[in-house]
């Protein structure tokens, strides 16, 4: 969390941002809140990006003001116009690009004063893994697949029964470049698995950590997966 305060002159207002990550090709949110004003027409929101001289987005007098927008953000940004009055200056960023990563500033002017706060925005690709029993293999084998990751992640297998065991010798991980030539499909195979055990395939890069679990018993197979974004700090 980053909390910024205003500058000299008028009173300062508190502006709060939260560091976040965007998934390439999907929509993302750059979070920013501020002390609300009673009059929408008195609120100005400017989003800026370090190293970019045009604006990312501007909202003033109750509507978007895009004459100064940098072309790299053209047609891809929107504020939640109906929530500005309650102090929400968050920016929706459509079709996140790798180059959108960087330091952004949320700058607010209201009748009460001015304020700003920075946020770090990371971009990459992350997806939920799915673990399945590979019935085509000669021995009991598990196959963990996740369709989109970037940068290249690490893959670690773990087991509930053999806690702390190193499975690197009995696993094989491959990365296949996807058609857009940025993200990669992750495939990891674990050999010599035993039944009545829960195995976890953990995929991690500097943006996200995802885990796919599979519990194999004689009578059933249970799966569970979850994904967690790393370094979500507020400012």
């Amino acid at each position: 969390l980053i909390i910024g305060f205003g500058i000299s002159g008028r009173h300062s207002i508190t502006v709060t941002t939260v560091a976040s990550a965007g998934n390439i090709g999907e929509d993302g949110i750059l979070s920013c809140t501020f002390e609300p004003d009673i009059k929408l027409s008195d609120i100005v929101i400017q989003w800026l990006k370090e190293g970019v001289l045009g604006l990312v987005h501007e909202f003033k007098e109750g509507k978007d003001e895009l004459s100064e927008q940098d072309e790299m953000f053209r047609g891809r940004t929107a504020v939640f116009a109906d929530q500005v009055i309650v102090g929400n200056a968050s920016l929706r960023l459509k079709n996140v690009q790798l180059t959108d990563a960087g330091t952004y500033k949320c700058y607010i002017i209201t009748s009460k004063g001015k304020g700003n706060a920075n946020l770090e925005y990371k971009t990459g690709a992350f997806s939920m893994p799915e673990v399945n029993v590979d019935y085509n293999a000669s021995s009991e084998t598990l196959r963990c697949e996740a369709p989109r990751w970037f940068p290249q992640p690490t893959v670690v297998w773990a087991s509930q029964v053999d806690q702390g065991a190193n499975f690197s010798e009995v696993s094989n991980t491959s990365f296949e470049l996807n058609s857009e030539n940025v993200t990669m499909k992750v495939v990891s195979v674990l050999y010599n698995v035993t039944i009545n055990n829960t195995y976890s395939c953990m995929i991690e890069n500097d943006i996200a950590k995802a885990t796919g679990d599979i519990k194999v018993t004689e009578s059933e197979i249970k799966r569970r997966s979850h994904l967690q974004l790393l370094n979500s700090k507020a400012s």
């Epitope: 190293g51 001289l53 004459s67």
Partner: antibody
């Protein structure tokens, strides 16, 4: 008052290189992109590319990649364009102009003549 | 690249006339259309940006309009000092591109 002062006319031989300058005053140099635009005799305007004076980052028109190199010197508030392997096709007036979506202030132009 | 077309390359008008110069883009440019004036000595000035916004110091007789792919510049009361060539430019997508220009002359 915003001013962009460009270097004087150049007469150079084919195959040579030339470096022209654009000195900015009346505003904070690092706050605005600097564009370069070509105008061949009696013709329209062609955008060559632009440079970000705050970090030296450049964007080029594909047509001028390898022909033009854009640089800045922050300490002098000056932008430069080098043109290499010159031919008669490069004879033109070259303008610098600041800002991104709508170049709002333009230099007076530098006339380049390529002739043996 | 986005092509910008000014169909009229030269235009004759009388002082006091209302003159309209048009410009067409090969695709929607979302109002990112600018107009420039180039005097015979080569001096280039921005007149209108973002379709209809008057640049500082530009006389109010100049106005701009349009949307999508079709845009125009209007001079409401032509003066001698308006004799120049007028260029449109799209600022929507790199590379920025210009129209071929419209040369305005006095009848």
């Amino acid at each position: 008052e915003v001013q962009l002062q460009q270097s004087g006319p150049e007469l150079v031989k084919p195959g040579a290189s030339v470096k022209m300058s654009c000195k900015a005053s009346g505003y904070t140099f690092t706050d605005y992109y600097m564009n370069w635009v070509k105008q061949s005799h009696g013709k329209s305007l062609e955008w060559i590319g632009r440079v970000n004076p705050s970090n030296g980052g450049t964007s080029y028109n594909q047509k001028f990649k390898g022909k033009a190199t854009l640089t800045v010197d922050k300490s002098l508030s000056a932008a430069y364009m080098q043109l290499n392997s010159l031919t008669s096709e490069d004879s033109a007036v070259y303008y610098c102009a600041r800002r991104h979506n709508y170049p709002d202030y333009w230099g007076q132009g530098t006339t380049l003549t390529v002739s043996s | 690249d986005i092509q910008m077309t000014q169909t009229t390359s030269s235009l004759s008008a009388s002082l006091g006339d209302r003159v309209t110069i048009s410009c067409r883009a090969s695709q929607d440019i979302s109002f990112y259309l600018n107009w420039y004036q180039q005097k015979p000595d080569g001096t280039v000035k921005l007149l209108i940006y973002y379709t209809s916004r008057l640049h500082s110091g530009v006389p109010s007789r100049f106005s701009g309009s349009g949307s999508g792919t079709d845009y125009s510049l209007t001079i409401s009361n032509l003066e001698q000092e308006d004799i120049a060539t007028y260029f449109c430019q799209q600022g929507n997508t790199l590379p920025w591109t210009f129209g071929g220009g419209t040369k305005l002359e006095i009848k």
